[in-house]
C-alpha cells in the first residue's frame, strides 16, 4: 500500500493592490493535482500580522483569498493543501506548508511619522481627519493622504487639505458613497528635502466614528402633579431614530444634578412641586444597534423653566 | 473584452537591448501569473519567462537566463522583458500571454496578445 | 527538460473528416498538457487544458486525451475554419515546452 502524497500550492504571495493595507493572497495548485481529479481539494490558509498571537485561519476550495491588514507591520501566512478522507480512502492528507511574508520596507524613523491622527465622521455625512505633523520634521516637510474602501477602482488622494503653516495638518473628505459598514483604509505618507518620512497606515470603519449633530428642539410637558416630560428632537441629518442614544444632564433648582442614558427621545422626571427651576441639555451618540463604537455629540443649548408653573403650560424653546 | 497589447519590438543589433511591454486590459491583471512566449522564423513556439501574480516568483527558459529579465507592475496593469546580450537566435514574434488558472491546472496560456517582432541582425 | 514529440507534422484533409494529432512526453506529466490552433497572421489560441478540458467558447468537435506521456487530439469533424497550425505543449513543471506544431491543409 503506497502512502498517498500530496505536494503544497504553488507560488504563495501576498499580492498588494495598492488598496493600503486590503490584501490579495494568491497561489497555484500543486504539481500533480491530476492524479486527484475526481476529488475536491482544499487548501488551509494562515495568516497574521507578525506580532499577533493568533492566525486566522480559512478553508477554502479557491486560489485566492482577500483580507485586510495592517501595513504598519509586516504580515505572515501559510498554506496547505487538504486532501480529503473521501480521495484517500481513509484520513485526510495534507502536505507541507508553503510560506510567505508581506511588508512594505519602512522609510525614515518612526517619529517622522504624523501624530495624533484622529478621524471624525461628522452627523454619519462629513469625514474629517487631523494630525500633527512629525516629531523633528522640519517646515519643508508635507504630508499627504490617501485612502480607499471597497468600491473605488484605486486609492484616492485628499484633494481638500487643511493646513497651518503652510502644512497639511488634515483632510476635508468629499461624499463618499456606500463607505460604511466596511473597512476604510487610510495612508498618509510625506516627502521632505531633509530626510525620509515613515508612512502611518490608518483601518477604521466609518460607522464607527460618527459625531451626530446635537438633539434639537428641547421642550417641558407636565405629565402629572410629579412628573415632568422632558422631549426632544432628532438631529437633523441622515441618522435613523432608531441608531441613538442619549445623555440628559438636568439641574432642578441649581442643587440636584440628574444624568440619564436613554434609547428614546423623552425622559420622564418626578419632581415636586416646589420646583422653581429646571434645566436640561441633551447630546447624541450613535447606538450598538447602529455601529460598535461613536463620539458623543456635543451638548444641545440649554433648555430652562423658571418661576412659572409648568401645570399651565408647555414650554417650547 | 480581454486584450494583451505588445509593445517596443523592433531591429537590433547582436549584443543590444530592447525593452518590450504589454498592456493588459479586461482583467484583474494582479490575479493571473503572465508569461512571454515567442516564435521562431521556423514557427515553433518557445516559452520565455514567467512572472507569478504578485511578482514574487518568476521561471526563465535556459536560453534566455542572466540575458532577459521578466517584471510586472500591477497598478500600471503592465507586463515587460528587458532583452540584453540579444543573439541572432533570438530573432522571433514575442507574445504576451496570460496563464490560465483553474483548480487543477495552471500553466498554460488562455490569452495571447497579437505579438511584436524583434529581429536581431547587423 | 520535458520534451514534446508532435505527429505528424501535416497533414492534407477535407471537411467533414476526423483528424487526430498526437503527443508524446519524455517523461510523465500526468494530464497537464494543452493544445492550441494558430491561424497564419494570428496568435495561437487555447482550446483544450489538463488534456481533456475545453477552454471557454471552443466547439465541442474538439477534444483531447491521455495521460501520462502519450496524448491525442481530434478534430471529429473538420471545417473550413479549422484549417490551421496546431500545438501541443505541456503544463506540468518548468521549462514548459510545445510541440513542433502540425499543419492541417486542404486536401
Known amino acids: 500500500d503506497t502512502e498517498i502524497k500530496v505536494n503544497p500550492p504553488q507560488d504563495f504571495e501576498i499580492v498588494d493592490p495598492g488598496y493600503l493595507g486590503y490584501l490579495y493572497l494568491q497561489w497555484q495548485p500543486p504539481l500533480s493535482l491530476d492524479h486527484f481529479k475526481e476529488c475536491t481539494v482544499e487548501y488551509e490558509l494562515k495568516y497574521r500580522n507578525i506580532g499577533s498571537e493568533t492566525w486566522k485561519t480559512i478553508i477554502t476550495k479557491n486560489l485566492h483569498y482577500k483580507d485586510g491588514f495592517d501595513l504598519n507591520k509586516g504580515i505572515e501566512a501559510k498554506i496547505h493543501t487538504l486532501l480529503p478522507w473521501q480521495c484517500t480512502n481513509g484520513s485526510e492528507v495534507q502536505s507541507s506548508w508553503a510560506e510567505t511574508t508581506y511588508w512594505i520596507s519602512p522609510q525614515g524613523i518612526p517619529e517622522t511619522k504624523v501624530q495624533d491622527m484622529d478621524c471624525v465622521y461628522y452627523n454619519w455625512q462629513y469625514l474629517l481627519c487631523s494630525w500633527k505633523p512629525g516629531i523633528g520634521v522640519l517646515l519643508d516637510t508635507n504630508y499627504n493622504l490617501f485612502y480607499w474602501y471597497e468600491g473605488l477602482d484605486h486609492a484616492l488622494q485628499c484633494v481638500d487639505y487643511i493646513k497651518a503653516d503652510g502644512q497639511n495638518i488634515g483632510c476635508r473628505f468629499p461624499y463618499l458613497e456606500a463607505s460604511d459598514y466596511k473597512d476604510f483604509y487610510i495612508c498618509v505618507n510625506g516627502s521632505s528635502e531633509n530626510k525620509p518620512i515613515r508612512s502611518s497606515y490608518f483601518t477604521f470603519q466609518l460607522q464607527n466614528i460618527v459625531k451626530p449633530l446635537p438633539p434639537v428642539y428641547l421642550t417641558f410637558t407636565r405629565e402629572s402633579s410629579c412628573e415632568i416630560k422632558l422631549k426632544w428632537s432628532i438631529p437633523l441629518g441622515p441618522i435613523p431614530a432608531r441608531c441613538f442614544d442619549y445623555e440628559i444632564e438636568i439641574r432642578e433648582d441649581d442643587t440636584t444634578l440628574v444624568t440619564a442614558t436613554v434609547e428614546n427621545e423623552t425622559y420622564t422626571l418626578k419632581t415636586t412641586n416646589e420646583t422653581r427651576q429646571l434645566c436640561f441639555v441633551v447630546r447624541s451618540k450613535v447606538n450598538i444597534y447602529c455601529s460598535d463604537d461613536g463620539i458623543w455629540s456635543e451638548w444641545s443649548d440649554k433648555q430652562c423653566w423658571e418661576g412659572e408653573d409648568l401645570s399651565k403650560k408647555t414650554l417650547l424653546r | 473584452e480581454v486584450q494583451l497589447v505588445e509593445s517596443g519590438g523592433g531591429l537590433v543589433q547582436p549584443g543590444g537591448s530592447l525593452r518590450l511591454s504589454c498592456a493588459a486590459s479586461?482583467?484583474?491583471?494582479?490575479?493571473?501569473?503572465m508569461s512571454w512566449v515567442r516564435q521562431t522564423p521556423d514557427k515553433r513556439l518557445e516559452w520565455v519567462a514567467t512572472?507569478?501574480?504578485?511578482?514574487?516568483?518568476?521561471y526563465y527558459a535556459d536560453s534566455v537566463k542572466g540575458r532577459f529579465t521578466i517584471s510586472r507592475d500591477n497598478a500600471k496593469n503592465s507586463l515587460y522583458l528587458q532583452m540584453s546580450s540579444l543573439r541572432a537566435e533570438d530573432t522571433a514574434v514575442y507574445y504576451c500571454?496570460?496563464?490560465?488558472?483553474?483548480?487543477?491546472?495552471?500553466?498554460?496560456?488562455?490569452?495571447w496578445g497579437q505579438g511584436t517582432l524583434v529581429t536581431v541582425s547587423s | 527538460d520535458i520534451q514534446m514529440t508532435q505527429s505528424p507534422s501535416s497533414l492534407s484533409a477535407s471537411v467533414g473528416d476526423r483528424v487526430t494529432i498526437t503527443c508524446k512526453a519524455s517523461?510523465?506529466?500526468?494530464?497537464?498538457v494543452a493544445w492550441y490552433q494558430q491561424i497564419p497572421g494570428k496568435a495561437p489560441k487555447l482550446l483544450i487544458y489538463?488534456?481533456?478540458y475545453r477552454s471557454t467558447g471552443v466547439p465541442d468537435r474538439f477534444s483531447g486525451s491521455g495521460s501520462g506521456t502519450d496524448f491525442s487530439f481530434i478534430i471529429s469533424s473538420l471545417q473550413p475554419e479549422d484549417f490551421a497550425t496546431y500545438y501541443c505543449?505541456?503544463?506540468?513543471?518548468?521549462?514548459?515546452?510545445f510541440g513542433g506544431g502540425t499543419k492541417v491543409e486542404i486536401k
Open positions: 489538463s488534456a481533456s
Open positions: 500571454a496570460r496563464q490560465g488558472t483553474t483548480a487543477l491546472a495552471t500553466r498554460f496560456f488562455d490569452v
Open positions: 517523461q510523465d506529466v500526468g494530464t497537464a
Open positions: 512572472v507569478s501574480s504578485g511578482g514574487s516568483y518568476i
Open positions: 479586461g482583467f484583474t491583471f494582479s490575479r493571473n501569473g
Open positions: 505543449q505541456h503544463h506540468y513543471s518548468a521549462p514548459w515546452t
